[in-house]
Amino acid sequence: CKAMHVAQPAVVLASSRGIASFVCEYASPGKATEVRVTVLRQADSQVTEVCAATYMMGNELTFLDDSICTGTSSGNQVNLTIQGLRAMDTGLYICKVELMYPPPYYLGIGNGTQIYVIDPEPCPDSDF
């Protein structure tokens, strides 16, 4: 297992609709054809997996159908979008990148992006 540098923004404020997008960039030492990207969430010292996708270079990322993540890739960059976020989901979202094929296997883990989520103000009651 070889180490690889992964860069991601330090902090992102989610939209009022609970959507946050950020780029995860990795310094690929070789010509990987198969890449796995995992998003981990760290909050109060607990780390949980948010979503993961394996893709072939040049192809779209495919997350599971019920995943809150979507993404696209371009070269050594992965543009990740996480939706359905609420204030309680605020936390550090860490991008983990694995170059699966061809060997050697490379692993890189970013410093994390603090995603801050604000629940929208409730709409005032309407008359209809």
Partner: antibody, heavy 118, light 108 residues
Framework: QVQLVQSGAEVKKPGASVKVSCKAS????????ISWVRQAPGQGLEWMGW????????NYAQKLQGRVTMTTDTSTSTAYMELRSLRSDDTAVYFC???????????WGQGTLVTVSS | EIVLTQSPGTLSLSPGERATLSCRAS???????LAWYQQKPGQAPRLLIY???SRATGIPDRFSGSGSGTDFTLTISRLEPEDFAVYYC?????????FGQGTKVEIK
């Protein structure tokens, strides 16, 4: 090293607007956020809001909603805070601060005194 | 809005003494999102503690933070002459982010 340099002192009349700038250097500007905090003479710190330089999304204090606008210019690594319809109780020192990975404000500008007086 | 109440308002102590500053929140605050700042007259605040107990870069180890839920404490183990200042707690876990009203640590 990280530095935040703010624009100079301003004197404004009630009802006018003021725009304070905060030029950042020493780090990747659009990877972080900028928060604005003000301090009236002899008083404590009041949080005004913050902007994510990464995507331009903002979060304002309810009290100032509608009067304040925070923006960034990533080409010059500068953040701006505009406050409209100024009143005498807006007289304060206005600080910008970097919002980092842990969200606390590790780096601050030197402050800009805004005086609102007729 | 989470209201932070600091006590005491003023603390009169001598250099070398221990200072204990309290910050009480009106609702529970995630300990990941509580900070302490020091401010001297005419200067910008300086971050001392973030995440309730993590010391910021370059902060001497005589400063320590503790607490969880609604009760947080900043302790200065042995006051140095340069520690006499105003101290603020801040929560940034729930919008709007808020500051306490401050505790002034003055020379007795």
């Amino acid at each position: 090293q990280v530095q935040l340099v703010q624009s100079g002192a301003e004197v404004k009349k009630p009802g006018a607007s003021v725009k304070v700038s905060c030029k950042a250097s020493g780090y990747t500007f659009n990877s972080y956020g900028i928060s604005w905090v003000r301090q009236a003479p002899g008083q404590g710190l009041e949080w005004m809001g913050w902007i994510s330089a990464y995507n331009g999304n903002t979060n304002y204090a309810q009290k100032l909603q509608g009067r304040v606008t925070m923006t960034t210019d990533t080409s010059t690594s500068t953040a701006y805070m505009e406050l409209r319809s100024l009143r005498s109780d807006d007289t304060a020192v206005y600080f910008c601060a970097r919002v980092g990975r842990h969200l606390a404000f590790a780096y601050w500008g030197q402050g800009t005194l805004v005086t609102v007086s007729s | 809005e989470i209201v932070l109440t600091q006590s005491p308002g003023t603390l009169s102590l001598s250099p070398g003494e221990r200072a204990t500053l309290s910050c009480r929140a009106s609702q529970s605050v995630s300990s990941s999102y509580l900070a302490w700042y020091q401010q001297k007259p005419g200067q910008a605040p300086r971050l001392l503690i973030y995440g309730a107990s993590s010391r910021a870069t370059g902060i001497p180890d005589r400063f320590s933070g503790s607490g969880s839920g609604t009760d947080f404490t900043l302790t200065i183990s042995r006051l140095e002459p340069e520690d006499f200042a105003v101290y603020y707690c801040q929560q940034y876990g729930s919008s709007p982010w808020t500051f306490g009203q401050g505790t002034k640590v003055e020379i007795k």
